[in-house]
Interface confidence: low
């Protein structure tokens, strides 16, 4: 048999939102289960669909799902059939409507003091509770003569007079929310005593000193009184102006003139009627001065030929709004065409170079007019007056390669060295038109060179080969002052280089031929075994064809080189004592002896009364102090070399003597003993 | 809900820099020309730099050479970086979102609530000593 484990039961439900009718059952065999709504089947849709064997409600419609729902499981094998208990929906919702006359038939029979009825067409369920408004304002039972029920949806206002003139509409609310009338009743109930509107002032603008005309009518039985008040109550009657205003004129009819205005005149103006009976009248219009403010300035642009482009006029700010459009060579320029006017942008479609020029946006209102100039250039690509050519450049003097080109605008140049970028620095300078200065050319600036020259249209580059011309130098320059060890083997080197190898040969400077010991070897001058006559000077001369000679003067000096005949030693002194550190040297010319002490130069003049350099070179410290205590460097030099020998120096505190020890017993280290 | 919040205001000396940012939301921020207003005290709202949605930059000519005003589209951010300030630069400084109908000294004018200007800031207050 078929079981129903779970059946759909009534419920409350809310207009377009979920619901679910719940349906579980239990059979031997497969039984396939449907929904009966008022006895029909249910078909599946977006919004009402099953889900298993329930049926769910995306969204409950208020007259598609009134009705008995019903679940329904067949066993199609056996034909055995069970159906669920009845189920409904208690469908809440509410509808706007509108505020319709009900009470008499129509408009044209509402009569002061007669009974009027309006109708709220707000329905919903559960049924709703009203309130009405009049002139957005809540009505109450009872108020100002009428009788409301604000459970019902009908007001009743009995008798209607004038007073009851207003835009009446309602709102309800129940279980389901709140609605509000879709469309309003505005109730007109005419008294010849209220004030009524014939002629309203309009907003104006006008320009400085020119004048402003307000009109304002009213009609009332007996005639209304008429006020006009400026921005902050000032009354203006024709008797009383406020300062501001001397030059307002108040007419018979209404109208309120204002002569020669200015800035301080602008703002709201109210005109007042007042009836013999009912509230004032109040109309507001406001008094705007026309002004229009500079317009910004255009950036110039340059543009391509064949491109489209667009060059938007910001309008300036204006009252009214100001006109504008664009000019060239003094004329309007058309609303379509190749280059036209569109909204506030000038369009140059498939711009040509005859387009150049100065283009005007102008802008106007009643207040004057604006123009702001824009200069169009139309680009070109550069072209060639002369291109960088192969050129061979002097080594040590400034080079030249030209790259002149001509375009609009200007064409910006640059040059590429070896495919890097030419930042200008001390030896690189591009002039103005393109030319590219080396200054002081040098061997490695043999290479190619391309120069670019480009504007917003497009580019043209050409390169150019360098061939550095050498001059002829010697490298390295030998050295004016050189020494020789005396009994020594010794050797001058001296080289050169030039457009061709250059020939290298060696002389004395006297003209006096070399001895047989000294050899000149392919500018290598060789002495085998260094004399005292092979001192003196002698000349390097470095020659080839095309660039003739050149000759380098060196002084040689023959010396006997340092040695050192005493070196300090390593010494140890008590504290308080005195320190020799012992240096002799010995060499041709005669070494001068200089100490160094702790990293610095010890200055013979400055030493002070504790330190002495002796003529011989040894150092002698007086009274030394522990800071005393470091390396100490002994340097002798002469004109021709230099050699430096180093010991430390220990300062120690004396030892108290012990008394095992004997008045012979020698000191753990070497001592200096004065 | 549409949001103009400027910062960076404070005091400064003359000669001296500041920096100011304005934040905007609720509103298509590329789609408009983005302004810089201020008004010192007792004085009408003057119009100071416009950035246009398409990057061009104009100036009054009170701050012409000494402020710049930059826009970040990406972060809808306008500002304004002002620089040699001077004492007569103390005002309450606005920017705004500017439709470009209207001008400022007539909103300043007949205008009795901010609801009557496009879209604008609360402002912020910038005080030069000398």
């Known amino acids: 048999a078929i079981v129903f484990i779970k059946q759909p039961s009534s419920q409350d439900a809310l207009q377009g939102r979920r619901a679910l009718l719940r349906c579980e059952v239990e059979a031997p065999g497969l039984v396939h289960v449907y929904w009966l709504l008022d006895g029909a089947p249910v078909q599946d849709t977006e919004r009402r669909f099953t889900q298993g064997s329930s049926l769910s409600f995306a969204a409950v419609d208020r007259l598609q799902d009134s009705g008995t729902f019903q679940c329904v499981a067949r066993d199609d094998v056996t034909g055995e059939e069970a159906r669920s208990a009845n189920a409904s929906f208690n469908i809440k919702w509410i509808e706007a409507g509108p505020v319709v006359l009900k009470h008499p038939a129509s408009e044209a029979e509402i009569q002061p003091q007669t009974q009027v009825t309006l109708r709220c067409h707000i329905d919903g369920h559960p049924r709703p509770t009203y309130q009405w408004f009049r002139d957005g304002t809540p009505l109450s039972d009872g108020q100002s003569n009428n009788t409301v029920s604000s459970k019902e949806r009908n007001l009743t206002l009995r008798p209607a007079g004038p007073e009851h003139s207003g835009l009446y509409s309602c709102c309800a609310h129940n279980a389901f929310g709140q609605a509000c009338s879709s469309q309003n009743f505005t109730l007109s109930i005419a008294d010849e005593s209220f004030a009524r509107v014939v002629l309203a002032p309009q907003d104006v603008i006008v320009a400085r000193n020119e004048e402003a005309m307000f009109h304002c009518q009213f009609s009332a039985q007996p005639p209304p009184n008429l006020q006009w008040l400026f921005e902050d109550e000032t009354p203006i009657t024709n008797r009383s102006r406020p300062p501001h205003l001397r030059r307002a004129t108040v007419f018979a009819n209404g109208s309120l003139l204002l002569t020669q205005v200015r800035p301080r005149n602008a703002g709201v103006y109210r005109c007042i009627g007042q009836g013999q009976r009912g509230p004032p009248v109040i109309l507001e219009a406001t008094l705007h001065l026309a002004e229009i403010e500079d317009m910004p300035l255009f950036e110039p642009r340059v543009f391509t030929a064949g491109s489209e482009e667009r060059v938007t006029c910001l309008p300036p700010k204006g009252l009214p709004e100001p006109s504008v459009w664009w000019e060239h060579a003094g004329v309007r320029l058309p609303t379509h065409g190749r280059v036209y006017q569109k909204g506030h942008e000038l369009v140059l479609a498939s711009i040509a170079e005859s387009d150049a020029g100065v283009y005007t946006c102008h802008a106007a209102n009643l207040a004057g007019q604006r123009r702001q100039d824009v200069n169009i250039t139309v680009a070109t690509v550069p072209t060639w007056l002369k291109k960088p050519q192969d050129s061979q450049l002097e080594e040590g003097k400034p080079g030249y390669l030209h790259c002149l080109t001509q375009a609009t605008p200007k064409p910006t140049v640059v040059w590429y060295r070896n495919q890097m970028l030419i930042s200008e620095d001390s030896r690189f300078e591009v002039f103005k038109n393109g030319t590219l200065r080396i200054n002081n050319v040098e061997v490695y600036d043999g290479t190619w060179y391309r120069c670019v020259s480009s504007t917003p249209a497009g580019s043209i580059e050409a390169q150019a080969r360098v061939q550095v011309l050498e001059k002829l130098k010697f490298t390295p320059p030998p050295q004016p002052q050189q020494c020789m060890e005396f009994d020594k083997e010794a050797t001058v080197p001296c080289s050169a280089t030039g457009r061709e190898k250059p020939t290298i040969k060696w002389e004395r400077a006297d003209g006096s031929s070399l001895p047989e010991w000294v050899t000149d070897n392919a500018g290598t001058l060789h002495f085998a075994r260094v004399t005292r006559d092979d001192a003196g000077n002698y000349t390097c001369i470095a020659s080839n064809g095309p660039q003739g000679q050149i000759r380098a003067h060196v002084q040689l000096t023959v010396a006997v080189f340092i040695t050192f005949k005493v070196e300090p030693e390593r010494t140890t002194v008590y504290q308080g004592h005195t320190a020799l550190l012992q240096c002799e040297a010995q060499g041709d010319p005669k070494p001068l002896i200089q100490w160094k002490g702790k990293d610095r130069i010890l200055d013979p003049t400055k030493l002070g009364p504790r330190m002495h350099i002796f003529q011989n070179g040894s150092l002698v410290i007086h009274d030394v102090a522990p800071e005393d205590s470091g390396r100490y460097t002994c340097i002798a030099g002469n004109s021709c070399n230099i050699k430096h020998t180093e010991a430390p120096l220990y300062v120690v505190d004396k030892p108290v003597p012990e008394e095992s020890e004997g008045p012979g017993s020698p000191p753990p280290y070497k001592m200096i003993q004065t | 809900q549409v949001q103009l919040q400027e910062s960076g205001g404070g005091s400064v000396q003359a000669g001296g820099s500041l920096r100011l940012s304005c934040t905007a939301s609720?509103?298509?921020?590329?789609?408009?020309?983005m302004v810089w207003y201020r008004q010192a005290p007792g004085n009408e709202y003057e119009w100071l730099s416009t950035v246009s949605r398409g990057g061009n930059l104009y100036y009054a000519d009170s701050v012409k050479g000494r402020f710049t005003i930059s826009r970040d589209n990406a972060k809808n951010t306008v500002y304004l970086n002002m620089s040699r300030v001077k004492p007569e630069d103390t005002a309450v400084y606005y920017c705004?979102?500017?439709?470009?109908?209207?001008?400022?000294?007539?909103?300043?004018?007949?205008?009795?609530?901010?609801?009557?200007?496009?879209?604008w800031g609360q402002g912020t207050q910038v005080t030069v000593s000398s």
């Open positions: 609720g509103f298509t921020f590329d789609d408009y020309d």
């Open positions: 705004a979102a500017d439709l470009r109908s209207v001008p400022s000294t007539y909103r300043a004018r007949t205008c009795r609530g901010r609801y009557c200007r496009d879209y």
